[in-house]
Interface confidence: low
């Protein structure tokens, strides 16, 4: 089940105390607290992109920035994987990948980055309201999923800017670069801190949340910092969503594959609590934490799909042959 | 109501050809995964593979791939599996079986199972 | 290939009592695991499937449990219509090899 953290609010300083100084030195800490809470946060990217040749063609592209190891990736669409959508495809960094239709081929594009092509033919074709996630598990940091569309006025060809530009290749120095700014961010604001010990500093609002209750964080994003800040998905699309979704099709890939079922239909679902934050204007992006893993080692309660794939020496990234060409 | 109907016994030598059918109906061809399960006299169950009507898709076991070769037919709704060069090993059961796709992961309906004999 | 070790290999039980068998698996299967019981002559039925849900038609007698490596199958209060063999399958990368089977037999 997932709960809502609250974000700090912050509070004015009392007029005529310290001025225009005053209320930036006081406003800079929670600024840097913010920061400080939210560095070890793992974030999702999600693109999605309509191909300018197949108007309903779609490329998906999704991304985890967090330092733990990933361990399963599920795309779906019509909404996040258990709360009414669709898995499209499921990749595992050892046992490999699988997919149904609409999805034509999915891929790994680097250790934490996934794509998959859509193609645009039949009944099961998206369309451009229609709603894509990408759900990392990953160990330590849990479970992330991150959902988006195409923004409502996409010209073909156009996409849907993946939400942290910038840090796309997080690379090791671009880790370390960034954790000494926070590093000396936080030390910065202990400083500052202590400096305000006199003055009672604000409350943070109390997190409903227990070591038990996986926590949901919500950023609001601003212009600036739309690269680390993210809006939690409030309304789950599915008016573009085919009948023929409820039977997914496997559909082409590595010749390594068996079957993938579900249990979507049997197992049960905790009530999925979403922020009532409207989409942002230049796509939707998500950043939910969905939980933690109960044990290490075991899948994340709610990843969807059962894994059920075919190990392979030569990798997920073999994608030629037929899907069972075995 | 769900079947899976198989075929008759096959009582054939050593070398020979053998096809089986499974013909499903009672429910979506598509969207099941057919099953093939082998059943020596007296022994275990062992999967020898499945095929998925709505592309063709189809995983085997690689102790049956080279010998097993497993085909759909839409149109029929029919599942087939023809198995090559047979010796004494492979008199057995045949079982076809369906498992729904990205549901169940169980094989929730299984034909009567078709008797295979080698024997010259 | 995943090695699925079934324990006991027949098990001589009278009406009303309760059985247990287990299933050990070679390695984490994620609960993708299922229970069939096939009587003399007969299929195979399904009884479980994910480890612990029952299709409908099985009666609540019957559960299933587990995780990780090690997975059992619980009959609480046997019936006569519940002797025959038992056999679990995975479903957690081709080949979906079963064990090698639980012969129930009444006492």
């Known amino acids: 089940m997932r709960t809502e953290a609250q974000v700090p609010a912050l509070q004015p300083p009392e007029p005529g105390l310290e001025g225009a100084m005053g209320h930036r030195t006081l406003v800079l800490p929670w600024v840097l607290l913010t920061l400080c809470v939210t560095a070890g946060t793992p974030e999702v990217w999600v693109q999605v992109r309509m191909e300018a040749t197949e108007l309903s063609s779609f490329t998906i592209r999704c991304g985890f920035l967090g330092s733990g190891s990933i361990s399963l990736v599920t795309v779906s669409w019509g909404g996040p994987n258990g709360a009414g959508g669709t898995t499209l495809a499921v990749l595992h960094p050892e046992r490999g990948i699988r997919q149904w239709a609409p999805a034509r081929q999915a891929r790994w594009e680097t250790q934490s980055s996934i794509s998959l092509i859509l193609e645009g033919s039949g009944a099961s074709s998206p369309c451009a309201n229609t709603t894509f996630c990408c759900k990392f598990a990953s160990f330590p940091e849990g479970s992330w999923e991150a959902c988006g569309s195409l923004p409502p006025s996409s010209d073909p060809g156009l996409s849907a800017p993946p939400t942290p530009a910038p840090i796309l290749r997080a690379d090791l120095a671009g880790i370390l670069g960034v954790s000494g700014v926070l590093l000396f961010g936080c030390v910065y604001l202990l400083h500052l801190l202590r400096r305000h010990k006199h003055r009672p500093a604000p409350r943070l609002q109390p997190s409903r949340t227990s070591p038990q209750a996986p926590r949901a964080r919500a950023w609001a994003p601003s212009q600036a910092s739309q690269a680390a800040l993210h809006v939690p998905y409030a309304t789950i699309n599915t008016s573009c969503r085919p009948a023929t979704l409820d039977t997914a099709h496997p559909h082409g890939g590595p010749s390594w594959w068996a079957s993938l079922p579900t249990h979507a239909a049997h197992r049960p679902q905790g009530p999925a609590a979403w922020a009532s934050t409207p989409i942002p204007a230049r796509g939707s992006f998500v950043s939910v934490e969905n939980g933690l893993y109960a044990q290490a080692g075991e899948r994340p309660p709610h990843t969807g799909p059962g894994l059920t794939l075919f190990p392979d020496p030569r990798g997920p990234r073999a994608m030629e042959g037929p899907l069972g060409v075995r | 109501e769900v079947q899976l109907q198989q075929s008759g016994p096959e009582l054939v030598k050593p070398g020979a050809s053998v096809r089986i059918t499974c013909k499903a109906s009672?429910?979506?061809?598509?969207?099941?995964?057919i099953h093939w399960v082998k059943q020596s006299h007296g022994k275990s169950l062992e999967w020898i593979g499945y095929?998925?009507?709505?592309?063709?898709?189809?995983g085997y076991n690689q102790k049956f791939k080279s010998q097993a070769t497993l085909t759909v037919d839409t149109s029929s709704t029919t599942a087939y599996m023809e198995i090559r060069s047979l010796t004494s090993e492979d008199s057995a059961v045949y079982y076809c079986?369906?498992?729904?796709?990205?549901?169940?992961?169980?094989?929730?309906?299984w034909g009567q199972g078709t008797s295979v004999t080698v024997s010259s | 290939d995943i090695q699925m070790t079934q324990s006991p290999a027949s098990l001589s039980v009278s009406v009303g009592e309760t059985v247990n068998i287990t299933c050990r698996v070679s390695?984490?299967?994620?609960?993708?695991l299922a229970w069939y019981q096939q009587k003399q002559g007969k299929s195979p039925q399904l009884l479980v499937y994910?480890?612990?849900n029952l299709p409908d038609g099985v009666p609540s007698r019957f559960s299933g449990s587990g995780s990780g490596t090690q997975y059992s199958l619980k009959i609480n209060t046997l019936q006569s219509e519940d002797f025959g063999t038992y056999y679990c399958?995975?479903?957690?990368?081709?080949?979906?090899?079963f064990g090698g089977g639980t012969k129930l037999e009444i006492k």
């Open positions: 390695e984490n299967i994620y609960s993708n």
């Open positions: 009672g429910y979506t061809f598509t969207d099941y995964n």
């Open positions: 079986a369906r498992e729904e796709v990205r549901r169940d992961e169980a094989l929730d309906f």
């Open positions: 095929i998925y009507p709505y592309n063709g898709g189809s």
């Open positions: 994910g480890a612990s």
């Open positions: 399958q995975h479903f957690w990368g081709t080949p979906y090899t």
